[in-house]
């Protein structure tokens, strides 16, 4: 492990589209990638009428807008999915949204995802 | 191993439209993004955009903004890029390549644009 | 975001090495180590053979090599081959809050 990083083998893994997709529901995704490459989890939810949907969490491949976030936080202003990711293991976890763009303190609070 | 497998060559009219395919395989196809390059007869290769494939979430390139849509259909594991008002500078080989660093590229689709 | 410039061609001997520069500015190569180089030969699409600057990608030879200075990356290729004749080109990551841009592209003939 690279000091100062934080190295991602492991990620939560959920899909709510799973039965479409063919996938399992949820559960621990080992995320595996080239070497030289670095590994991150994402989530991705609705926001719909203040009712937080999970869509799916899970591995991310290298994306440098994912380098050195510990926390999963989307930064985009009202998104129509929202999406995050991270680094470390099963950052994706804890999820929130925190835009950028807002001149006033955001009132955002960390979403701690419960299946439906 | 991974595969991005694209639609076949297409002919259009001026003013038309073309809608390219890029069928991914050898990974999860929602662990990162779709992006869309083109190289015209001849020249250099030129970024269109890119589509976050879990999310949807898009990003064009200003030249093609108002013409260029990109979607995505997860179940199928499939990146569309749809071209609209074409024309004939337009004709080139479109290719779609996964992730940030286009670590993979497809075969790409010629698309020829002549009346 | 603007392209980046690279030279339109360059030529070497098999054996010699030859270096392929990509120019930016401060805010895209000079900023970020985020710069990628692809090798394209005629008819073929792209392949990635370095990211971020200097990681090469797996299966690619070590005779090549990236590296960056201040606005300008550069691509260099030892022991020159007669199939690395081909069309070199620069670019930036590109997803999310990111654009992507290439270089011109240059053609590396082998003399």
């Known amino acids: 492990a690279i000091l100062g990083r934080s190295e991602t083998q492991e990620c939560l893994f959920f899909n709510a589209n799973w039965e479409k997709d063919r996938t399992n529901q949820t559960g621990v995704e080992p995320c595996y990638g080239d070497k030289d490459k670095r590994r991150h989890c994402f989530a991705t939810w609705k926001n719909i009428s203040g009712s937080i949907e999970i869509v799916k969490q899970g591995c991310w491949l290298d994306d440098i807008n994912c380098y050195d976030r510990t926390d999963c936080v989307e930064k985009k202003d009202s998104p129509e999915v929202y999406f995050c990711c991270c680094e470390g293991n099963m950052c994706n976890e804890k999820f929130s949204y925190f835009p950028e763009m807002e001149v006033t303190q955001p009132t955002s609070n960390p979403v701690t995802p419960k299946p439906p | 191993q991974v595969q991005l497998v694209q639609s076949g060559a297409e002919v259009k009219k001026p003013g038309a439209s073309v809608k390219v395919s890029c069928k991914a395989s050898?990974?999860?196809?929602?662990?990162?993004?779709i992006n869309w390059v083109r190289q015209a007869p001849g020249q250099g290769l030129e970024w269109m955009g890119t589509?976050?494939?879990?999310?949807?979430?898009?990003s064009y390139a200003q030249k093609f903004q108002g013409r260029v849509t990109m979607t995505r259909d997860t179940s199928i594991s499939t990146a569309y890029m749809e071209l609209s008002r074409l024309r004939s500078d337009d004709t080139a080989v479109y290719y779609c390549?996964?992730?940030?660093?286009?670590?993979?590229w497809g075969q790409g689709t010629l698309v020829t644009v002549s009346s | 975001q603007s392209a980046l410039t690279q030279p339109a061609s360059v030529s070497g001997s098999p054996g010699q090495s030859i270096t392929i520069s990509c120019t930016g500015t401060?805010?895209?190569?000079?900023?970020?180590?985020?710069v990628n180089w692809y090798q394209q030969h005629p008819g073929k699409a792209p392949k990635l053979m370095i990211h971020?600057?200097?990681k090469r990608e797996s299966g690619v030879s070590n005779r090549f090599s990236g590296s960056k200075s201040g606005n300008t990356a550069s691509l260099t290729i030892s022991g020159l081959q007669a199939e690395d004749e081909a069309d070199y080109y620069c670019?930036?990551?590109?997803?999310?809050?990111?654009?992507?841009?290439f270089g011109g592209g240059t053609k590396l003939t082998v003399l």
């Open positions: 050898g990974y999860t196809f929602t662990s990162s993004y």
């Open positions: 971020g600057v200097s």
């Open positions: 670019g930036t990551f590109a997803g999310g809050s990111y654009y992507g841009v």
């Open positions: 401060s805010s895209d190569v000079g900023s970020y180590d985020y």
């Open positions: 589509i976050n494939a879990v999310s949807g979430s898009t």
């Open positions: 390549a996964r992730g940030g660093w286009f670590d993979y």
